[in-house]
Amino acid sequence: VQNSCDNCQPGTFCRKYNPVCKSCPPSTFSSIGGQPNCNICRVCAGYFRFKKFCSSTHNAECECIEGFHCLGPQCTRCEKDCRPGQELTKQGCKTCSLGTFNDQNGTGVCRPWTNCSLDGRSVLKTGTTEKDVVCGPPVVSFSPSTTISVTPEGGPGGHSLQVL
């Protein structure tokens, strides 16, 4: 004989000894019908705020408050936004690799320094993790360009940037 709990919809719970579909109580949810209990809704507080409120069929979703970003599956923790010279990765904020920079506060990825030689210009001021290179005026007599090898942190090397 088929258990009538099998016919219960999401947003309800059902006990085998009394197989009646009952609505989830407030602040609980069930995304699958026929379960013996509803799950307690996630509460977004402190560094978290609600991205999606809880319903009888879906858990609440949290995001981080201004100035913080999510880490972990389903935004399990909040970390302070990255500073200039850093970019966000799965592990959190990481310093830009050699040859890249990020001048933004809190957002953005590390991007490569400008290649001054593309415009036939020299490097007036070398780049940092926070600032792009400053290109000088066009070079009149072109000397052969040299290649420097950039080895990103954790990487095998072999990325090239052209500098004059």
Partner: antibody, heavy 121, light 111 residues
Framework: QVQLQQSGAELAKPGTSVKLSCKAS????????IYWVKQRPGQGLEWIGN????????FYGEKFMGKATFTADTSSSTAYMLLGSLTPEDSAYYFC??????????????WGQGVLVTVSS | QVVLTQPKSVSTSLKSTVKLSCKLN????????VHWYQQHAGRSPTTMIY?????PDGVPDRFSGSIDSSSNSAFLTINNVQTEDDAIYFC??????????FGGGTKLTVL
């Protein structure tokens, strides 16, 4: 909506060059990396390199240094890849793809339709 | 040199559940995000899972992603497999934030 439109198929002779284009629309071209990916028929995906169109800065995979050259024209929101000194080994599909600026290890959210380059004498 | 290893081919039956693996040879699978792409013959890849376990809009909730640090692997699970799931699946992560790495791809055959 975001789109990456690539140029048509290329048939080239060994030793020559081809220039592939990838025209972006529906977003700010200068604010996202464009990646280039190679796929030989029936094979896996291989990173060639990437360009930041905002300043023309580039990175190349070790294997593709001297083989590929990236440029970007911000006025037409188009990224280009020049493939030089072609050999039959360069016969493949070439895709351009965009990476979001959320994190340094993010996915490629939009891809071009791919270009088949065939190198044959 | 970071390598992501995927089984060359996997066969499964219609309406079953299949779990595709992507093993990192060195380093920690938790260091960088893992993403999954589906590619049908003659088409460009499309994202099925991004940032380990997130599903883009329009991707059925039959698809889910997970990370297992004990086996240093990422997994793409497909429930209630459909004929349209017959495709090649690639995993994608990073060696450094400059250097993306792809798995060799798994050809999923739906019987």
């Amino acid at each position: 909506q975001v789109q990456l439109q690539q140029s048509g198929a290329e048939l080239a002779k060994p030793g020559t060059s081809v220039k592939l284009s990838c025209k972006a629309s529906g977003y700010t071209f200068t604010s996202y990396y464009i990646y280039w990916v190679k796929q030989r028929p029936g094979q896996g995906l291989e990173w060639i390199g990437n360009i930041w169109p905002g300043n023309g800065g580039t990175f190349y995979g070790e294997k593709f240094m001297g083989k590929a050259t990236f440029t970007a024209d911000t006025s037409s929101s188009t990224a280009y890849m020049l493939l030089g000194s072609l050999t039959p080994e360069d016969s493949a599909y070439y895709f351009c793809a965009r990476r979001p600026d959320y994190s340094g290890d993010d996915y490629f959210d939009y891809w071009g339709q791919g270009v088949l380059v065939t190198v044959s004498s | 040199q970071v390598v992501l290893t995927q089984p060359k081919s996997v066969s499964t039956s219609l309406k079953s559940t299949v779990k595709l693996s992507c093993k990192l040879n060195s380093g920690n699978i938790g260091s960088y995000y893992v993403h999954w792409y589906q590619q049908h013959a003659g088409r460009s890849p499309t994202t099925m899972i991004y940032r380990d376990d997130k599903r883009p809009d329009g991707v059925p909730d039959r698809f889910s992603g997970s990370i297992d640090s004990s086996s240093n692997s990422a997994f793409l699970t497909i429930n209630n497999v459909q004929t349209e799931d017959d495709a090649i699946y690639f995993c994608h992560s990073y060696d450094s934030t400059i250097t993306p790495v792809f798995g060799g791809g798994t050809k999923l055959t739906v019987l």
